[in-house]
């Protein structure tokens, strides 16, 4: 059957932990992505940012997992109003910020 939302979120959190701890070299060669507002709709916004990073196998699973939280199809070059379009940060910092926010959402029971 379908994975419960709480399990899916926990698995996403654990995948982000794996990414942050396994990096010897800069994550995705130090690629920069648009920062996002960590509010409603931020799963799609996070995917929109990360999908523009190509050739980085370390985040491919994260991209797939985020697509499960986003109700619409996301493609490269697509941007929502949730992006802070004047601020780019390294993928590693993006992942750390997203991870901390998701842990707080999990605590609050916001699984979707």
């Amino acid at each position: 059957g379908p994975v419960p939302p709480s399990t899916a979120l926990r698995e996403l959190i654990e995948e982000l932990v794996n990414i942050t701890q396994n990096q010897k070299a800069p994550l995705c060669n130090g690629s920069m992505v648009w920062s996002i507002n960590l509010t409603a709709g931020m799963y799609c916004a996070a995917l929109e940012s990360l999908i523009n990073v190509s050739g980085c196998s370390a985040i491919e699973k994260t991209q797939r997992m985020l697509s499960g939280f986003c109700p619409h199809k996301v493609s490269a070059g697509q941007f929502s109003s949730l992006h802070v379009r004047d601020t780019k940060i390294e993928v590693a910092q993006f992942v750390k910020d997203l991870l901390l926010h998701l842990k707080k959402l999990f605590r609050e029971g916001q699984f979707n």
Partner: antibody
């Protein structure tokens, strides 16, 4: 100011019962999850249990499950810990502590009482 | 049940930086809180949610949490920082709160 004050500690024989109380003041007691944490002499902190802000749920450490019961009276701003079938290993300073209530209560304990000593000895 | 591992003791000279670690399986997936306890006193929250600091706690205290290790860092250590420090998490699987064994910080 915000305060938690425990009372009811003392010396009790193994197998007997004891009830600890915690009086809260200076904050909106009914909006906080409330915990008991204990510390055996010379040892580290051990979580005992929690009661949700509205008293609707309790959770306990395995070491006290079935023996200890946490209750609260939001009209009187009081928290209680009923301890039955006490054992020597229950000897400790018992602290009450508050934590903002979330859905899954994974919060920090941001206010602690001064503690009350419980000694279980024959 | 979930286990948190801390070094029993850490020693540091005044003015130096103290680093206290808290190890646990995928602890990075959990929100970690840190408490300071001085002899004969109740614990005091010094870091919550991995890296946030209560308003009354000096900026010298900071926290991080990556992978299997959470870290409490105290920079420019003072004699008054001498205390026991405990990390703590909530374990989703057992629905219980877990403390590390504690680390005694000695200021030389």
């Amino acid at each position: 100011q915000m305060q938690l004050v425990e009372s009811g500690g003392g010396v009790v024989q193994p197998g007997r019962s004891l009830t600890l109380s915690c009086a809260a003041s200076g904050f909106e007691f009914r909006t906080y999850g409330m915990h008991w944490v204990r510390q055996a002499p010379g040892k580290g902190l051990e979580w005992v249990g929690v009661i949700w802000y509205d008293g609707s749920a309790t959770h306990y450490a395995d070491s006290v499950k079935g023996r200890f019961t946490i209750t609260r009276d939001n009209s009187k701003n009081t928290l209680n810990l009923q301890m039955n079938s006490l054992r020597a290993e229950d000897t400790a300073v018992y602290y009450c502590a508050r934590a903002p209530q979330w859905y899954l209560t994974a919060e920090a304990f941001d206010l602690w009482g001064q503690g009350t000593m419980v000694t279980v000895s024959s | 049940s979930y286990i948190l591992t801390q070094p029993p003791s850490v020693s540091v000279a005044p003015g130096e930086t103290a680093t206290i670690t808290c190890g646990g399986n995928l602890i990075g997936a959990k929100l970690v809180h840190w408490y300071q306890q001085k002899p004969g006193q109740a614990p005091v929250l010094v870091i919550y949610d991995d890296s946030d600091r209560p308003s009354r706690i000096p900026e010298r205290f900071s926290g991080s949490n990556i992978g299997n290790t959470a870290t409490l860092t105290i920079s420019d250590v003072e004699a008054g920082d001498e205390a026991d420090y405990y990390c703590q998490v909530w374990d989703y699987y057992s629905d219980t709160y877990v403390f590390g064994g504690g680390t005694k910080l000695t200021v030389l």
